[in-house]
Structures are given as C-alpha cells and as structure tokens.
C-alpha cells in the first residue's frame, strides 16, 4: 500500500494498461494545454487516448487520480475503486466533457499500442507471464505487477519455465517477488534473482501477486513464469501444508479473497 495521486491504495492499480498511460509535464500536474498534451503523446510515438480506450484500460485496473486530456479535447480520469479524495465516490471514467477552451491546463492520457507493457489483472485459469521483451533481454528501470484472482476456493500453481535475472547476493538489483495475496505487502513468499529456476509455488488461496523490478544498470535474459488453476477437488491441493514437498512449495493457509 502507498499514498499516491491523492489516495491510499495498493499496487493493483496499474500505471499502464491496454496501451494507455498517464503523462504530466516536467513542472508537475495540470500544466498541459490540449496542443501540448497531444505533442507529449506524439513525441513518444503515441496519440491521445480516446474515451473508449481509457475505459478499456480502466476495466483491467488502470486507475489514476488526475484529470487529463483525451482525444477530441475531452478531459477525464479513470477510477477503478472509489476513494474519499478522488472520483466523488464513483467508479468509471470521471468525465469533464469536451472542453471549449483548449488552453485549459490538464495532464494527458496517451495511447500507444506498441508500448512495452507488463503486468495486469488476470482471472484466466492459466497463463504465462514473461518479462518485457522476452526472449530478448529486459530493459532497465522496469516495474511490473501481475495480480492473479481466481474463483473462490481455487488455488494457484506457479512454475518457473525460464529464469535469468542479474545476480547479486541480496537480490537488490533485479528481482521477482511473489506474494500470497492480492497486494505486494502481505503474504510475502520470496524474492528471486540469478539464473537458477526457483521451485514451484502453490498459493493458499485464490489470489497471488508477482512483482518484477529491474534497476538502472545490468540486464539479463528475463523469465517466463506459468500459472495454472488448482481446483478444490484436485489431489495436489490436498497436500500437507509443509514448507516444501518435492519440488513444490506449499504455503500455510492465510489469505483468501472473494
């Protein structure tokens, strides 16, 4: 959890989703005219996001408490979860409408379908997460969150297919962290780096969070991490809550979320 954009929330809220991202001027919030907002997006190879694109991003977790220009001179911002200081207690796109005065100063919402993205909120029964650009080396200064939320009663079986991150003794530079919860605070399982494949992990509940961070220097090959659903009736979910059994790590039951 952390204080950001005027509200207290956890890292489920994505910084970028479905090609949509938020930009502000170097001088800070609400400094861009419509023409400047357009320029910001275009200089990065994108364009101002449409209302539909912003809403599509919001639906998969894009949440920013700052009004910004969209295509056609519209202004608004995406709210996933209402908060007292943001969005008037509503969810959805808080829409200020099409502005007649294009010299008003707001932030910008850009859309770039080619932007390298990572992370998201996932409810599929199985999926493979890859470091950005895999199988090519990942870039410096990456931060990605993958939040898995399955049906109540289901569990998550995580396995590492490829793994090659910069190695340092404390995994302080580049690392993957796994949390047996829906945020990056509770249920810490472990931090991983180097090129040894970590053992499989099975969650205690129906949610899990993976965080990938790379620093500003050395990069490496990256990773592929697969998850599959373990249904309540399946044999592996009945295993004892021991720290490790074979090549699987079972976590003592703590976190479950509807």
């Amino acid at each position: 959890w952390g204080f950001k954009n005027g509200i207290f929330h956890n890292s489920i809220w994505l910084e970028q989703a479905a090609g949509v991202y938020h930009r502000e001027a170097r001088a800070g919030r609400y400094k861009l005219t419509y023409a400047e907002a357009k320029a910001v997006c275009e200089f990065e190879g994108g364009r101002l996001a449409t209302y539909k694109q912003l809403e599509a991003a919001r639906k998969i977790g894009f949440h920013v408490c700052a009004a910004g220009w969209m295509a056609k001179g519209r202004v608004g911002y995406p709210i996933v979860k209402p908060g007292p200081n943001c969005g008037f207690g509503k969810t959805g796109i808080i829409d200020y409408g099409i502005r007649l005065n294009r010299s008003e100063r707001w932030d910008a919402y850009c859309y770039n379908p080619h932007a390298k993205e990572c992370g998201g909120v996932f409810t599929d029964p199985k999926r493979i997460f890859k470091s950005p650009g895999f199988p090519n080396e990942y870039d410096d200064n990456q931060v990605c969150y993958w939040h898995i939320r399955l049906k109540y009663g289901q569990r998550i079986h995580l396995s590492f297919l490829d793994f090659d991150l910069e190695h340092d003794p404390g995994c302080l530079a580049d690392y993957v962290e796994i949390y047996d919860s829906y945020d990056d605070v509770h249920g810490f399982v472990g931090r991983y780096c180097g090129d040894e494949l970590p053992e499989d992990i099975i969650s205690t509940g129906n949610v899990m969070t993976l965080k990938f961070l790379s620093d500003a220097s050395v990069t490496a090959g990256g990773f592929q991490i697969k998850y599959v659903t373990v249904d309540p009736a399946s044999k592996s979910s009945q295993a004892k809550n021991t720290s490790t059994t074979g090549n699987k790590k079972f976590l003592p039951g703590r976190f479950s979320h509807l």
Epitope: R23, A25, R26, L32, T33, V40, E42, F43, K116, D140
Partner: antibody, heavy 120, light 106 residues
Framework: QVRLQQSGAELAKPGASVKLSCKAS????????MHWVKQRPGQGLEWIGY????????KNKQNFKDKATLTADKSSSTAYMQLSNLTYEDSAVYSC?????????????WGQGTTLTVSS | ENVLTQSPAIMSASPGEKVTMTCSAS?????MHWYQQKSSTSPKLWIY???KLASGVPGRFSGSGSGNSYSLTISSMEAEDVATYYC?????????FGSGTKLEIK
C-alpha cells in the same frame, strides 16, 4: 560524469553515405532520449530528430526523413546517425545531445560534434 | 513549424552594462530554453524552463517571458559572456532554435 563521445571527422563524396556515432557514458543510456543537431559553418542550429533508445522509436524533422536514419545499440550505449545520398549542403558539424524525456524537452548534455565535409 | 526570431542579431555591451536579448515565437509556447555557444565548441544549456539557470551558470543571468515573447538578461556584462545565445522550444514538433544573438564586448 555524463559524456557523449562522438566519432571523428568524416570526408565523403557526393552520393555516398556516412554513419556517425555517439557513445554515451556516465548515465543509463535507455533512460534518456538522444537527439541530433546540425550546424553549418557560420550558421545556426537545426534539429534533425531523436531516438528513444529503450524502444527504438525515432522521429525526424520532415526535411531529414529521407536523409537521416537514427539507430541505437543498447549493449554499447551508442547512438548512430546514418546520412545518405550526401550533397554539398550536408557539409556541417553534427552533434548528438540528450534529453530526459520529460516535457517540454531540452538538451542538457551535448557531444563535441563531428565535422562532415562533402567534397568531390 | 514554430519559428523563433531573435533580436538583435548582433549586439555589443561594455563591461558592467545590462544586456537584454529577446526571442519571439510564431506560436505560443509554455516554456523557452536558452543555449550559450562559444566559437568552435558545442552549445551549453544555459537557461531552461524559461527562468531556471543550468548548473554552473552565473547568477547575473536571468530568463523571463511567456506565450510568444521571451528574453534573456545579463545584469552586468562580463568578458566571459561573449558568445552566441540561441533560444530553443521543445514543446512542439519540430523542435526549433532561434537564429541566435551574437554578444560582443565593447
């Protein structure tokens, strides 16, 4: 400290191509954008275009679209500009300069410049 | 293209004299930046975001302006200030420089 080291002077014939380099050190190459600027003798400065090394995205000024090709090699922290189909008007000093990608843009560090002479 | 017109093209000032040069933009911009270039060297960032002095720039320099009109001022001219000064806008495509003001000493 930040340093942008450019390749040495070039002498080329009309119609030929040259590839100028700009090696960055003292900072994280992929965290900044690299721009190229042209200056003809006794004249002002003209922006050519830029590359975002992290993504490879480039944007050139319209009149340099067919003239300048910008590339970057992340492994060696080097930006390149290839100038093709050279004419006498391409004789100039070409400088690389970095910006931090925050808007509005400015160049905080410059290379020392590469002198290109086009002569038959 | 946003054309930046600098005036005067050439000026000279005595040591200790106040110097002001201007930059006029054909389209309004929120910020202007300034570069100093001495002969046979690369330009140096001198003033950014209209009024912020780059690292190592003496306090006698200042920048101001808004919209279409910006200026660079030296409160008290010194010999080391002899150079050409270029204004620059990084707000719109294509990025553009002014034609420069050459500052000489009397």
């Amino acid at each position: 400290q930040v340093r942008l080291q450019q390749s040495g002077a070039e002498l080329a014939k009309p119609g030929a191509s040259v590839k100028l380099s700009c090696k960055a050190s003292g900072y994280t190459f992929t965290s900044y954008w690299m721009h190229w600027v042209k200056q003809r003798p006794g004249q002002g400065l003209e922006w050519i275009g830029y590359i975002i090394p992290s993504s490879g995205y480039t944007k050139n000024k319209q009149n340099f679209k067919d003239k300048a090709t910008l590339t970057a090699d992340k492994s060696s922290s080097t930006a390149y500009m290839q100038l093709s189909n050279l004419t006498y008007e391409d004789s100039a000093v070409y400088s690389c300069a970095r910006s931090d990608g925050s808007y509005p843009y400015y160049f905080d560090y410059w290379g020392q410049g590469t002198t290109l002479t086009v002569s038959s | 293209e946003n054309v930046l017109t600098q005036s005067p093209a050439i000026m000279s000032a005595s040591p200790g004299e106040k110097v002001t040069m201007t930059c006029s933009a054909s389209s309004s911009v929120s910020y202007m930046h300034w570069y100093q270039q001495k002969s046979s060297t690369s330009p140096k960032l001198w003033i950014y975001d209209t009024s912020k002095l780059a690292s190592g720039v003496p306090g006698r320099f200042s920048g101001s302006g808004s919209g279409n009109s910006y200026s660079l001022t030296i409160s008290s001219m010194e010999a080391e200030d002899v150079a050409t000064y270029y204004c620059f806008q990084g707000s719109g495509y294509p990025l553009t420089f002014g034609s420069g003001t050459k500052l000489e000493i009397k």
